[in-house]
Interface confidence: low
């Protein structure tokens, strides 16, 4: 018997297209397919940045695939040809790795790119960047951000920096159109009369860096003699009910008496009759069934009761 | 409504391979998990393996490590089990299972609350 062997894929590369980080990885089919006609040939393809302790696989029929990356680091990518069992009349063959590598050229030393880069997308409505200048650039050193996302045709500069001592110091950005629920790219590159800036890369989805506004319509009612319903609204704009975690801190005669997380615009509280005075605020977050992650919104306005007899009271605010 | 189809199991002796394949159909969004289960018989079912549609991040419990791979088809809509060095204790029924609600997987041992559509099942059976 002849042992069965199978070329690796032809022409790999990785093709950058410009859109900060999301890249495409292409490839030819191998040469000399002709024994294998009645065949279809599937790729088994890797992938990871560099320093990466795993790869990304991916078994396709297709000649390429697409997947975003960290381009402050390079990318490695290696592919081989799959001959699956029903081709061979045995067992699966695979031919050698095909690898290559992609970087981009890093310009400037670190310390001149941009500093705790930080943004947040508000109420889910407004996206705002903000960073400090690279240590020891000169007052002459400008910041531009450009972003991405899929849905745009190409990368688009911010058009409206927020700036200190004429230096950009930050991006607000403009209505994002379907925007969340996907990789948002971005790149912060800088330029100088005297030293050449190092660009920086981030990577993040919108829904997980949303900083809700607070709750409103802060109420108390009175739901027995010993329980007390705690009530509140969502706040204003596009978030949905379904989305929240809340966070409340309850006051009773100036001593914390609790804080709880719940899910609903609800909170019933055990009192005692001895109580003179309940003060409760509450805070909200996106939750667990909208994003991986998010920002605690400010505190709403406190709503308090004072009398000389809470058990006896309906109290609505 | 999401149907889950798996497929791939049967027979094999210890030590040996398997792929399992999951097809994912009826559904609408891009971001979503999927998670293969296991149950042996008189046992609890267990999670597996688990890989996100958007970030590719993938977890696996302790006991399969090093063996099983997950993966993910072009079309996003298949993902596989690749099982090799294969263990008698291996042998159950294996589940694919999708929750459309997250876009990255939780942590192994708390798998099993996050998930909303469930595959019929297909057996794996290690034996000499």
């Known amino acids: 018997d002849t042992e069965i062997k199978v070329n690796p894929p032809q022409d790999f590369e990785i093709v950058d297209p410009g859109y900060l980080g999301y890249l495409y990885l292409q490839w030819q089919p191998p040469l000399s397919l002709d024994h294998f006609k009645e065949c279809t040939v599937e790729y088994e393809l890797k992938y990871r940045n560099i320093g990466s302790e795993t790869w990304k696989t991916i078994i396709t029929k297709n000649l390429h695939y697409k997947d975003g990356f960290d381009l402050n680091k390079g990318i490695e990518a290696k592919i081989h040809t799959l001959l699956p069992w029903q081709c061979t009349n045995g067992s699966e063959v695979q031919s050698s790795w095909a690898e290559t590598t992609y970087w981009i050229s890093p310009q400037g030393i670190p310390e001149t790119k941009v500093q705790d880069m930080d943004c947040v997308y508000y109420n889910w409505q407004y996206l705002l960047c903000s960073w400090k200048p690279g240590i020891g650039v000169l007052l002459d050193t400008n910041y531009n951000l450009f972003y991405w996302y899929e849905g745009l045709d190409h990368a688009l500069q911010c058009v409206d920096y927020i700036k200190a001592d004429g230096q950009n110091i930050g991006c607000r950005f403009p209505y994002l159109e379907a925007s969340d629920y996907k990789d948002f790219y971005i790149c912060v590159n800088g330029s100088s009369e005297n030293k050449p800036i190092r660009s920086s890369y981030f990577t993040f989805q919108l829904q997980n860096i949303v900083k809700p506004l607070p709750p409103v319509y802060l109420t108390f009612t009175r739901e027995s003699s010993c329980e007390i319903k705690l009530k509140w609204s969502i706040p204003l704009g596009p978030i949905p009910a379904r989305c929240f975690d809340y966070e409340i801190e309850i006051r009773e005669d100036d001593t914390t008496l609790v804080t709880a997380t719940v899910e609903n615009e609800t909170y019933t509280l055990k009192t005692t009759n001895e109580t003179r005075q309940l003060c409760f605020v509450v805070r909200s977050k996106v939750n667990i069934y909208c994003s991986d992650d998010g920002i605690w919104s400010e505190w709403s306005d406190k709503q308090c009761w004072e009398g000389e007899d809470l058990s006896k009271k309906t109290l609505l605010r | 409504d999401v149907q889950l189809v798996e497929s791939g199991g049967g027979l094999v002796q210890p030590g040996g391979s398997l792929r399992l394949s999951c097809e994912a159909s009826?559904?609408?969004?891009?971001?979503?998990?999927i998670g293969w289960f296991r149950q042996a018989p008189g046992k609890e079912r267990e999670g597996v393996s688990c890989i996100s549609s958007r970030y590719a991040n993938t977890v696996y419990t302790d006991s399969v490590k090093g063996r099983f791979r997950i993966s993910r088809g072009t079309a996003k809509n298949t993902v596989y089990l690749q099982m090799s060095a294969l263990k008698p204790e291996d042998t159950a029924v294996y589940y694919c299972a999708m929750d459309s609600r997250r876009v990255t997987c939780p942590e192994i041992s708390t798998m099993h609350r996050n998930f909303d559509s469930w595959g019929q099942g297909t057996q794996v059976t290690v034996s000499s």
């Open positions: 009826g559904f609408a969004s891009d971001d979503y998990i």
